[in-house]
């Protein structure tokens, strides 16, 4: 587990505690909440980040804004169970023994049930659509400049391989970023699109997860790109299993943020 050896910190995750007692006497950074050692040369998994967020002292926790709600009764913030590799366990349960199945980004994909509910496998979210609306500007951004800047952001800040940024669409003031990553495409060491999307989501909200780095300062040809609304859609390799009544209202999971 690599980290800045000189002062033993985790550049990619400020929700950690680091000490020089890792294998070989190296710096080891543990995620708050789970205590799992994280690899500070890459993004931390969303599951461990959510767990860390929920374990933070009450007075230090970022409160959920009233406007931050998840449609399809997607319970937004919760204290998840993560597997030994830090991924979401397919079945999540709360303290009152209510259980549900989630996808690889931790979004509920079934109706809620009891402890007898079975979730046979962790279903992969292979397509993420990030829908942004930017604040009014003097004129529209140049599409190719915007495309290049957002691709650069995902490549450099989140270390996401460029091939996983499928497209950037723009119809002022709406920007859509499409991330695609099938199970077969994701190689060992590749950043997961779900983790990249979560870091981006937190950056957009001014809650950067990076240690000591300034907040996200998005600019296109020097012009600030200020986001006033974010909507994130998650599409799974296997369609979700909600009751028919529910499916007539919603066709896919989405988060809504202001």
């Amino acid at each position: 587990h690599t980290a800045a050896q000189d002062n033993c910190t985790c550049p990619t995750n400020k929700m950690t505690v680091c000490s020089p007692d890792g294998p070989g006497g190296r710096c080891q950074c543990r995620a708050l909440g789970s205590g799992m050692a994280v690899d500070c040369s890459t993004l931390t998994s969303k599951c461990l980040l959510l767990k860390a967020r929920m374990s933070a002292p009450k007075n230090a926790r970022t409160l959920v804004r009233p406007s931050e709600h998840a449609l399809v009764d997607n319970d937004g913030l919760y204290d998840p169970d993560c597997d030994p590799e830090g991924r979401f366990k397919a079945r999540q349960c709360n303290q009152t023994s209510v259980c549900w199945c989630v996808n690889s980004v931790g979004v509920r994909r079934t109706d809620k049930g009891d402890l007898s509910l079975r979730c046979d496998e962790l279903v992969r979210t292979h397509h993420i659509l990030i829908d942004l609306r930017h604040r009014p500007t003097a004129g529209a951004f140049n599409h190719s400049d915007l495309d290049a800047e957002l691709r650069r952001l995902f490549r450099e800040r989140y270390r996401l391989h460029p091939k996983f940024v499928a497209a950037v669409h723009y119809e002022q003031p709406t920007i859509q970023i499409e991330l695609r990553q099938n199970t077969s495409q994701k190689a060992a060491g590749d950043v997961d699109i779900g983790d990249a999307a979560y870091y981006f989501e937190r950056d957009i909200k001014g809650e950067s997860l990076f240690q000591g780095r300034g907040g996200l300062d998005l600019r296109v040809r020097g012009e600030p790109l200020q986001v006033e609304r974010t909507l994130i859609y998650y599409l799974d390799e296997i369609p979700p299993k909600f009751s028919m009544k529910r499916l007539t209202h919603h066709h896919h999971h989405h988060h809504h943020h202001h």
């Epitope: 033993c8 505690v17 000490s19 020089p20 007692d21 890792g22 294998p23 070989g24 080891q28 708050l32 789970s34 205590g35 799992m36 050692a37 030994p84 590799e85």
Partner: antibody
Framework: QVQLVQSGAEVKKPGASVKVSCKAS????????IHWVRQAPGQGLEWIGT????????VYNQKFRDRATMTRDRSISTAYIELSRLRSDDTAVYYC????????WGQGTTVTVSS | EIVLTQSPATLSLSPGERATLSCRAS??????IHWFQQKPGGSPRLLIK???ESISGIPSRFSGSGSGTDFTLTISSLEPEDFAVYYC?????????FGQGTKLEIK
């Protein structure tokens, strides 16, 4: 050389509280986790929790979360554990240990809970 | 929580023999396992960290191996002072836990 020196033995009545100290020397106190472990007579080792002295971030074994409090005083490189509402089955030797692999241990503090 | 199961509970051997102690984790913990020796009335002493890393001051007859869920502490040739209780402990995630111990006794 690295040393962890604990406070002396304690005898307490059920329902009382006890506070055990662990004074560290020979290394940078703030950079290594301090763990608390106990061992009941004739039994194995049981992890109570850990504290990171730099920022006092503490993690508790669920079993002790309601009764144990770990603190530290950086100015004197000392960690503390307080256990409240003592019961007879809290009778044990309490150890502090350093780092994730417990490379150095205190000599142990015997806590006896008896009416 | 991660459960560590040590076997055997008691191992009876003679000085000069080879001792093999086992520790099994209830889930994959990589190499985040550490081994301790404890003698009556004393504090535990670290023998091996991260499954196979040696510790300064610990005799070379003590070695460790394994990863994932199965781990082994080996004492190549037992000395009289090696008869004690041995514990494994994991540091993969919180809560840390210990195995129940293996008592190594003189045959």
């Amino acid at each position: 050389q690295v040393q962890l020196v604990q406070s002396g033995a304690e005898v307490k009545k059920p329902g009382a509280s006890v506070k055990v100290s662990c004074k560290a020397s020979g290394y940078s106190f703030t950079t290594h986790w301090i763990h608390w472990v106990r061992q009941a007579p004739g039994q194995g080792l049981e992890w109570i929790g850990t504290i990171f002295p730099s920022n006092a971030y503490a993690v508790y074994n669920q079993k002790f979360r309601d009764r144990a409090t770990m603190t530290r005083d950086r100015s004197i490189s000392t960690a503390y554990i307080e256990l409240s509402r003592l019961r007879s089955d809290d009778t044990a030797v309490y150890y502090c240990a350093r780092a994730s692999y417990f490379d150095y241990w205190g000599q142990g503090t015997t806590v006896t809970v008896s009416s | 929580e991660i459960v560590l199961t040590q076997s055997p509970a008691t191992l009876s051997l003679s000085p000069g023999e080879r001792a093999t102690l086992s520790c099994r984790a209830s889930q994959n913990i990589g190499t985040s396992i550490h081994w301790f020796q404890q003698k009556p009335g004393g504090s535990p002493r670290l023998l091996i960290k991260y499954a196979s890393e040696s510790i300064s001051g610990i005799p070379s007859r003590f070695s460790g191996s394994g990863s994932g869920t199965d781990f082994t502490l080996t004492i190549s040739s037992l000395e009289p002072e090696d008869f004690a209780v041995y514990y494994c402990q994991h540091s993969h995630s919180w809560p840390f836990t210990f195995g129940q111990g293996t008592k190594l006794e003189i045959k």
